[in-house]
């Protein structure tokens, strides 16, 4: 995705133009990938009755979904900008094996999947230009994210399903704790 | 290229009331946020109010129980009716839209409010 232009010279003329600060587009960025992930959980819970089964334990074995922890340094407890802001890069390529296994897995919200999927991307972007220490972000590995892939297709339906949902899930709880740490800085 | 054109700008009294409405034309892309900001003279840029495209709002501390934003998607318009105006409340609006799948963004001309007696 492209990343946005800095300041060009109708700023100078127009002080409203100035571009948004990047925080700024931080918080639109998360509070419209959540907005997303609203409505795709819509749809997940209207088609099957995932969102009250008591199962989830039996597909979680399969997911190793990141989570925020105390010693991410998220927490308003033992806040720690600079570990925490690589946390949530981390986490956020971390999942996005999972948001490319979602891009077929709705019918009417097909565009708003991909909506979540490309804003994810850019809000990635964004974060690393924050971040000081890129050395301590590892990258997932694109062979095990690729074998992942295609465990997870070879599920039968309520298994499919079922991780559906707990992506949906637990992308909206790290980006709500992200958003939360996101606003300290 | 995307247009953004704002109307119901003036004058109006202590206590009054407006509705502003910003109307979107050309290519827009239907995921986006769509808000106002707003900038008084000698005065830093703030955002006002903000809605995304499944109608989740946000709202500045200081127009909060004041000021509503709602859109009509089939439009592409947003609007911001402000009640219980405030002298502070004068500046100039400007619509804004944010577009997350690419991070780039849209404003508006910009339309003076004014709270005055």
């Known amino acids: 995705a492209p990343v946005p232009p800095g300041e060009d010279s109708k700023d100078v003329a127009a002080p409203h133009r100035q571009p948004l600060t990047s925080s700024e587009r931080i918080d639109k960025q998360i509070r419209y990938i959540l907005d997303g992930i609203s409505a795709l959980r819509k749809e997940t819970c209207n088609k099957s009755n995932m969102c009250e089964s008591s199962k989830e334990a039996l597909a979680e074995n399969n997911l190793n979904l990141p989570k925020m922890a105390e010693k991410d340094g998220c927490f308003q407890s033992g806040f720690n900008e600079e570990t925490c802001l690589v946390k949530i890069i981390t986490g956020l390529l971390e999942f996005e094996v999972y948001l490319e296994y979602l891009q077929n897995r709705f019918e009417s919200s097909e565009e708003q999947a991909r909506a979540v999927q490309m804003s994810t991307k850019v809000l990635i972007q964004f974060l690393q230009k924050k971040a000081k220490n890129l050395d301590a972000i590892t990258t997932p590995d694109p062979t095990t994210n690729a074998s992942l892939l295609t465990k997870l297709q070879a599920q039968n339906q309520w298994l499919q399903d079922m991780t559906t949902h707990l992506i949906l899930r637990s992308f909206k709880e790290f980006l709500q704790s992200s958003l939360r740490a996101l606003r300290q800085m | 290229q995307v247009k953004l054109e704002e109307s119901g700008g003036g004058l109006v009294q202590p206590g009054g009331s407006l509705r502003l409405s910003c109307a979107a034309s050309?290519?827009?892309?239907?995921?986006?946020?769509m808000g106002w900001y707003r900038q008084a003279p000698g005065k830093q840029r703030e955002l006002v109010a903000d809605?995304?495209?499944?109608?989740?709002?946000m709202y500045a501390d200081s127009v909060k129980g004041r000021f509503t934003i709602s859109r009509d998607n089939t439009k592409n318009t947003v609007y911001l009716q402000m009640n219980s105006l405030k002298p502070e409340d004068t500046a100039v609006y400007y619509c804004?839209?944010?577009?997350?799948?690419?991070?780039?963004?849209?404003w508006g001309q910009g339309a003076q409010v004014t709270v005055s007696s």
């Open positions: 050309g290519s827009i892309s239907r995921f986006n946020i």
């Open positions: 809605i995304t495209n499944g109608g989740t709002t």
């Open positions: 804004h839209t944010y577009y997350p799948t690419t991070g780039f963004d849209d």
